[in-house]
Interface confidence: medium
């Protein structure tokens, strides 16, 4: 229904927190370089605006709609050309395309320093003099740092940061209760993060219907007692929010989402019998529970899948009267037979299934062409599988950080060019795959390996669209969402690729390594790793092995001497020419 | 029991509308996705439209989009098909369904109500 005034509609719909909470992760996105105190100070003022839209519709200015007030806010910010350069020039355009100006320039890898936890004590200080400010913070950090963070799920993140301070700052050892909760709660929202990337990136460039399809496989496996016409209705009402969401439109976009939680739990009858729990739940916890409710269970007296899709005569007929739907059939049925299947897999099935029927259906004797199409499946189920052997196998034995380094060598023969600093963080990721997936039940394991793998590699063909260097990726990130991971798999190492000379200054360690954490150590490491395959991109693992061990020795050999500066510079020169050596 | 009852059918000439209605009863209407499938004579069963149980979305075969409308009133119980537009390869015997989980199977239906398309 149309209301007069837009902005007062969202302020009474999601309640003052939440609508001051969705317009700071806006500003946020939109200009990721300016200060907290900046955006807090905007946030205000589209605050009091649409209060007093809510006490007057008809006031000056209330009817605009959010993308128009959202804009203005934005291009009256001082000195937007000096800090955002050409995003500046979005300004001199007409809604809607200075909100689709202002989308093009989310930056995905914006250089801001990493996101650094203060100490817990200083941590509850600020969280107790001021918990609206604190929070404001880590919404305000985390949206900037991650543009298309889905933003009702950041909410639920900042409350569930809310929740654990306030239950550790009352301990007597806040650091010990703090740092395992928070560490966790950090891994989930950047999961989240990947995941929404790609929803998006989905949407971007492949449109509304390529994302409807994603969502008609993942609900028909979670509710597979659900019938089509719920699926669907499902899959539109969600295609809508995350169109919402990715498009920018966070207000309304939370607001839908609210929407259909209430939906599903007013219809739990006609969609899963497992979604009471998470509909007992407040909002937002609601909304995070039902996105990850565990799968129904699968109706005992399922067809086979080929009396409609192969055995029957109807089968062209029904494809050519509604091409769509039937698929849209197709895509459902075989999806609640396969909750052990991946999304993307479930996808390439059904756009296997549709190039036979295209091919088969013009053919004189059609059943007899796509009689087959189900045994021509199978090597498209056998390939994930095999994926997931390997490499649950490779994790098993080597563990994560080792499992993160085989990664990385696998990524910088398949593509040299790409910087390493990006080689790192995506082998890092994918090689968490290990400890995310492959500890799981065996039916559980290929969907877990498969579609993160997939969110990942969408960050890295995104981080490769900035600065294009590798022909491999290129051709890998340019063909449809769902071939790229196994595109990416079956790159083998890149012959046209000129090796990189050996410069020892790479190589060279002083002693302020030895007083980085863990995780910093380990990037030094890989960083090193990585530079070593550029120079010899034939390496044997062998050969790595010895020189990895060799700098894990000298690491630890300097880091333990009495005087480190002399350790590092006198045995630093001994290990560059070791690893020559092994390596000529 | 489940009783569908078709109704509103008749003769009409190309390019006439007709409304048919089908009165559901035995079953919660209001949780269920319905249907409406036509067979001419001598032909298979096709189906024509869908709608989900809240009104939306609906969905229509290619032959009949944007000439025919589904649409429910679940306080009534009952389920309308508008038909505008109509041509010769319309006439068919019309049934309404309650929508199965297996694309073709329908699990109840009623008579059928005819539909003459004819100058």
């Known amino acids: 229904e149309a209301h007069k005034s837009e902005i007062a509609h969202r302020y009474n719909d999601l309640g003052e927190q939440h609508f001051k909470g969705l317009v700071l992760i806006a500003f946020s996105q939109y200009l990721q370089k300016c200060s907290y105190d900046e955006h807090a100070k905007l946030v205000q003022e589209v605050t009091d605006f649409a209060k007093t839209c809510v006490a007057d519709e008809s006031a000056a200015n209330c009817d605009k709609s959010l993308h128009t007030l959202f804009g203005d806010k934005l291009c009256a910010i001082p000195n937007l050309r000096e800090n955002y350069g050409e995003l500046a020039d979005c300004c001199t355009k007409q809604e809607p395309e200075r909100n689709e100006c202002f989308l093009q320039h989310k930056d995905d890898n914006p250089s801001l320093p990493p996101f650094e936890r203060p100490e817990a004590e200083a941590m509850c200080t600020s969280f107790k003099e001021n918990p609206t400010t604190f929070m404001g913070h880590y919404l305000h950090e985390v949206a900037r740092r991650h543009p298309y963070f889905y933003a009702p799920e950041l909410l639920y993140y900042a409350e569930q940061y809310n929740e654990i301070l306030t239950q550790c700052c009352a301990e007597a050892d806040k650091e010990s209760c703090l740092t395992p909760k928070l560490d966790g709660v950090k891994e989930k929202a950047l999961v989240s993060s990947v995941r929404q990337r790609m929803k998006c990136s989905s949407m971007q460039k492949f449109g509304e219907r390529a994302f409807k399809a994603w969502a008609v496989a993942r609900l028909s496996q979670t509710f597979p007692n659900a019938d089509f016409a719920e699926i669907t209705k499902l899959a539109t009402d969600l295609t809508k929010v995350n169109k919402e969401c990715c498009h920018g439109d966070l207000l309304e976009c939370a607001d839908d989402r609210a929407e259909l939680a209430k939906y599903m739990c007013e219809n739990q009858a006609t969609i899963s019998s497992k979604l009471q729990t998470c509909c007992d739940k407040p909002l937002l916890k609601k909304a995070h529970c039902l996105s990850e409710v565990e799968h129904d269970t699968m109706p005992a007296d399922l067809p086979a899948i080929a009396a409609d899709f192969v055995e029957d005569q109807e089968v062209c007929k029904n494809y050519a009267e509604a091409k769509d739907v039937f698929l849209g059939t197709f895509l459902y049925e075989y999806s609640r037979r396969h909750p052990d299947y991946s999304v993307s897999l479930l996808l390439r099935l059904a756009k296997k299934y549709e190039a036979t029927l295209e091919k088969c259906c013009a053919e004189a004797n059609p059943p007899a062409c796509y009689g087959t199409v189900l045994a021509e499946f199978q090597p498209l189920v056998e390939e994930p599988k095999n994926l997931v052997k390997t490499n649950c196998d490779l994790y098993e034995k080597l563990g994560e950080y080792g499992f993160q380094n085989a990664i990385l060598v696998r990524y910088t023969q398949k593509a040299p060019q790409v910087s390493t600093p990006t080689l790192v963080e995506a082998a890092r990721n994918l090689g968490r795959v290990g400890t995310k997936c492959c500890t799981l039940p065996e039916d559980q394991r290929l969907p877990c390996v498969e579609d993160y793998l997939s969110a990942i590699l969408n960050r890295v063909c995104l981080l490769h669209e900035k600065t294009p260097v590798s022909e491999h990726v290129t051709k890998c990130c340019s063909g449809s969402l769902v071939e790229r991971r196994p595109c990416f798999s079956a790159l083998t190492v890149d012959e046209t690729y000129v090796p990189k000379e050996f410069k020892a200054e790479t190589f060279t360690f002083h002693s302020d390594i030895c007083t980085l954490p863990e995780k910093e150590k380990q990037i030094k490491k890989q960083t090193a790793l990585a530079e070593l395959v550029k120079h010899k991109p034939k390496a044997t693992a062998e050969q790595l092995k010895t020189v990895m061990d060799d700098f894990a020795q000298f690491l630890d050999t300097c880091c333990k001497a009495a005087d480190k500066d002399t350790c590092f510079s006198t045995e630093g020169p001994n290990l560059v020419t070791r690893c020559k050596d092994a390596l000529a | 029991e489940v009783q569908l009852l078709e109704s509103g059918g008749g003769l009409v000439q190309p390019g006439g509308s007709l409304r048919l209605s089908c009165a559901a009863s035995?079953?919660?209407?209001?949780?269920?996705?319905m249907l409406w499938v036509r067979q001419a004579p001598g032909k298979g069963l096709e189906w024509v439209s869908v709608i989900h149980q809240s009104g939306t979305p609906t969905y229509y075969a290619d032959s009949v989009k944007g000439r025919f409308t589904i649409s429910r009133d679940n306080s009534k119980n009952t389920l309308y098909l508008q038909m505008n537009s109509l041509r010769a390869e319309d006439t068919a015997v019309y049934y309404c369904?309650?929508?199965?989980?297996?694309?073709?199977?329908?699990?109840?239906w009623g008579q059928g109500t005819l539909v003459t398309v004819s100058s």
């Open positions: 035995g079953f919660t209407f209001d949780t269920s996705s």
């Open positions: 369904a309650k929508f199965p989980s297996t694309h073709g199977k329908f699990d109840y």
